[in-house]
């Protein structure tokens, strides 16, 4: 049978020929009668065999990392017969490892992100090196990791390559670190080979900065003419965090001004001071408010960095604006009796300059020929007034500053013209009637009524009488109905058309005013020839009768 030991050849041997071992048959008695042959990959080129002795040699430098074993076949032939002495056999040559490879980091580049202010021990990243040498051959591929750069902030676990934080870091002081890790084989013993890698560690932001006002005092101005909602200025706080950690909200401290408000512009992170209520320079010309600023959102664990909100004081100066005159009242109502003489007093209006300089005021009444106003605001009549023509005047009074005629205010003025009893009552219409020649005494021939152009505080009451002449010598009489009407009755029997065709009766109508006024009104009565039935036959002034609508046949 075949006789051999396991074959090993060290890699990287520089000699031209290196004896590996011997192949032999136990039938070989050493008389050189057998011939040994080597077949397979590497036979003749990498390995040779001494045909007589079976000694095997490596004739090339080998690299275990390229090929760690060779499988060859051996033959032994009897030279005399040419026949195989032993069956062909397979054997293995193993290439033994030497430490000829340094550790290599294959996953470069390494980059990691870790939150700032992370506690000691926080895992950052794991780096891994590989060594091409044989891990089963001593310590050639046993690695140890160490930190060449990155102390005191980082540490590396020697056997795993896990990088951890060893000291808190503040992004606002330094936002990235380059850490250099070395991997050594031979567990760091003498003769070890090493490789290095760089790790870029970036710090992500946490909300460990509160916003702080750059200025402890801001000075702003607002015009007293500014409407509510006006932006009067901006204030600015700074937060060195980034992104949403720097978002802030501005507000006014409690119990401060009700006149101003602060809103936050979330795009610019500015505070905009807004006028909440109109200001008046003459009432208050400066304000002081305290504004504060806080982050929009602070996680509970970071509240220790936000114990007290930053504040700033805002001094707001109100700018004086030349304001128009201000009337004491929003409108004025005066009363004046009609028929008062020209120049009579009506009333007094008053306007003042609300500004501190207190400009004198000039007054005018727009489009009025009936009233005058002087520089004191006293209104007088410029004509006699007649209530029966105009009972009310709707006017406009204008006040103008003497030193700035552009500053004008106008308000309504209402003047009521009060009634005096200056009109007597009179017939409500023109009365013309007739009486039949054959009329009997006491016959009603006309009902009359009166009107009075005057206004009555109580109801009008009229009194009807015949004039003195007609009372003493009258063919007619009058009865006052006590309801502002009266009836005319015949005071005799029979009338003669030829003798006396027309009667003119004077009727006195008096009112209940103080003093009472009386008017004389004429009632025309025509005498007509009437039939038995009382229908009109003939009247003088037939046309008139016809026009009066009397029936004729």
């Amino acid at each position: 049978g075949w006789v051999w030991n396991q074959f090993f050849v060290p890699e990287e041997m520089n000699t031209t020929s290196h004896h590996i071992g011997q192949l032999r048959s136990d039938l070989d008695n050493g008389n050189n009668s057998f011939q040994y042959k080597l077949l397979g990959a590497g036979a003749g080129s990498t390995f040779i065999i001494d045909e007589r002795t079976g000694d095997i040699y490596a004739i090339q430098k080998l690299d275990r990392e390229e090929r760690s074993l060779y499988i060859l076949r051996a033959q032994v032939i009897d030279i005399a017969t040419g026949r195989a002495v032993e069956p062909e056999s397979e054997f293995v040559i193993k290439v033994s490892d030497i430490n000829d490879n340094e550790p290599k980091f294959l996953d470069e580049p390494y980059e990691a992100i870790v939150p700032e202010m992370s506690p000691e021990g926080t895992l950052v990243i794991q780096v891994t090196a590989s060594d091409a040498d044989d891990p089963s051959s001593g310590n050639n591929a046993r690695l140890l990791y160490s930190l060449l750069q990155g102390q005191p902030y980082f540490s590396v676990e020697p056997t795993t390559g896990v990088i951890r934080i060893s000291s808190k870091m503040d992004r606002e002081l330094q936002d990235e670190y380059w850490v250099i890790i070395q991997a050594k084989d031979m567990i760091g013993q003498p003769g070890a080979l090493s490789g290095t890698t760089s790790v870029l560690i970036k710090l992500s932001d946490v909300n460990d900065n509160k916003p702080i006002f750059k200025e402890s005092l801001y000075r702003l101005t607002v015009s007293e003419s500014a409407p509510t909602g006006t932006s009067i200025g901006t204030i600015m706080a700074y937060d060195n965090d980034i992104g949403e950690n720097a978002e802030m909200d501005y507000s006014i401290e409690e119990d401060d001004s009700q006149t101003f408000d602060i809103i936050t512009n979330h795009e610019t992170q500015e505070g905009i001071v807004i006028l909440k209520k109109k200001v008046d320079f003459e009432h208050q010309n400066h304000y002081g408010i305290r504004a504060k600023v806080k982050n929009h959102h602070v996680p509970e664990q970071l509240m220790k960095y936000h114990t007290e909100a930053s504040t700033t004081f805002i001094k707001i100066q109100v700018e004086d604006v030349d304001e128009p005159p201000l009337f004491l009242l929003p409108y004025y109502v005066f009363e004046v009796f009609e028929e008062t003489p020209q120049g009579s007093f009506v009333g007094v209006v008053s306007a003042t300059d609300p500004d501190n300089r207190k400009s004198p005021i000039r007054y005018s009444i727009t489009r009025s020929k009936v009233f005058n106003i002087n520089d004191n605001g006293t209104i007088t009549t410029s004509n006699s007034l007649d209530r029966e023509i105009s009972a009310w005047y709707n006017l406009s009074i204008t006040a103008t500053e003497k030193y700035n005629i552009e500053q004008i205010s106008s308000i309504p003025l209402y003047v009521q013209v009060l009634n005096i009893n200056d009109h007597a009552p009179e017939f409500s219409q023109y009365y013309e009637t007739y009486v039949c020649e054959n009329a009997g005494s006491g016959q009603v021939i006309q009902t009359i009524s009166a009107v009075d152009r005057d206004e009555s505080i109580e109801e009008h009451h009229f009194y009807f009488n015949l004039s003195v002449e007609d009372t003493n010598n009258s063919s007619f009489t009058i009865i006052d109905n006590q309801d502002n009407t009266a009836v005319i009755l015949t005071n005799r029997t029979g009338f003669n058309l030829q003798e006396e065709p027309v009667f003119y009766i004077s009727i006195l109508i008096a009112d209940n005013g103080i003093p009472s006024l009386t008017s004389t009104n004429t009632l025309t009565i025509h005498v007509c020839d009437c039939g038995d039935s009382g229908s009109t036959q003939t009247c003088q002034y037939q046309e008139l009768v016809l026009s009066m609508g009397f029936k004729t046949e």
Partner: antibody, heavy 125, light 105 residues
């Protein structure tokens, strides 16, 4: 290592001028704002002036305003303090100091993390 | 703007030392603290009220509320004997307190 070294101190008469320098090494000088701080003999620290990382903004204590000028030359990694109209009360050790905080941060929240050894200025007749 | 500190504070070794710094509405601002030993330059020990710069032991701590900021040194050691200054920022200017001399008895 990170280092600041002041120079230029000395004895000067009242009304005179002096220029202090501060040489920086071991860090990216152009990324940091810089301060000058002084300390009168037996007294406390007094802030003098500050300059932004790029020199675009400068701030001064009221006591030195219009007399002292802070400047920097980033190509030479050097900070300067030009002092004129010097008074007896300007006598002090002058320190340059680095403002902690990356570019983009505002304010002096993070203190002065690197100081020079100081240079002595004596104003005396 | 003014920051007021007590001129001196004494503490026994191993005890807790508290140094105060007062100013109007100081709690709304951020405060830094510096340590200065005789003949040396100042060193930043606390910034932004309560944060530690690299290399500063955690026995130094800070707080800030109302009108007062406080630097607390727990387990005070002889090496902590120094002058301590508070510093704040107001309207683009830096303000230092007058300084407090900490004596470790």
């Amino acid at each position: 290592q990170v280092q600041l070294v002041e120079s230029g101190g000395g004895v000067v008469q009242p009304g005179g001028s002096l220029r202090l320098s501060c040489a920086a090494s071991g860090f990216t000088f152009s990324s940091y704002g810089m301060h000058w701080v002084r300390q009168a003999p037996g007294k406390g620290l007094e802030w003098v002036a500050f300059i932004w990382y790029d020199g675009s903004n400068k701030y001064y204590a009221d006591s030195v305003k219009d007399r002292f000028t802070i400047s920097r030359d980033n190509s030479k990694n050097t900070l300067y303090l030009q002092m004129k109209s010097l008074r007896a009360e300007d006598t002090a050790v002058y320190y340059c100091a680095r403002r902690a905080g990356i570019i983009g941060t505002i304010g002096y929240y993070y203190g002065m993390d690197v100081w020079g050894q100081g240079t002595t200025v004596t104003v005396s007749s | 703007y003014e920051l007021t500190q007590p001129p001196s504070v004494s503490v026994s070794p191993g005890q807790t030392a508290s140094i105060t710094c007062s100013g109007d509405r100081l709690g709304e601002k951020y405060v830094s603290w510096y340590q200065q030993k005789p003949g040396q330059s100042p060193i930043l020990v606390i910034y932004q009220d309560n944060k530690w710069p690299s290399g500063i032991p955690e026995r130094f701590s800070g707080s800030n509320s109302g009108n007062t900021a406080t630097l607390t040194i727990s387990g005070t050691q002889a090496m902590d004997e120094a002058d301590y200054y508070c510093q704040a920022w107001d309207s683009s200017t830096v303000v230092f307190g007058g300084g407090t001399k900490l004596t470790v008895l």
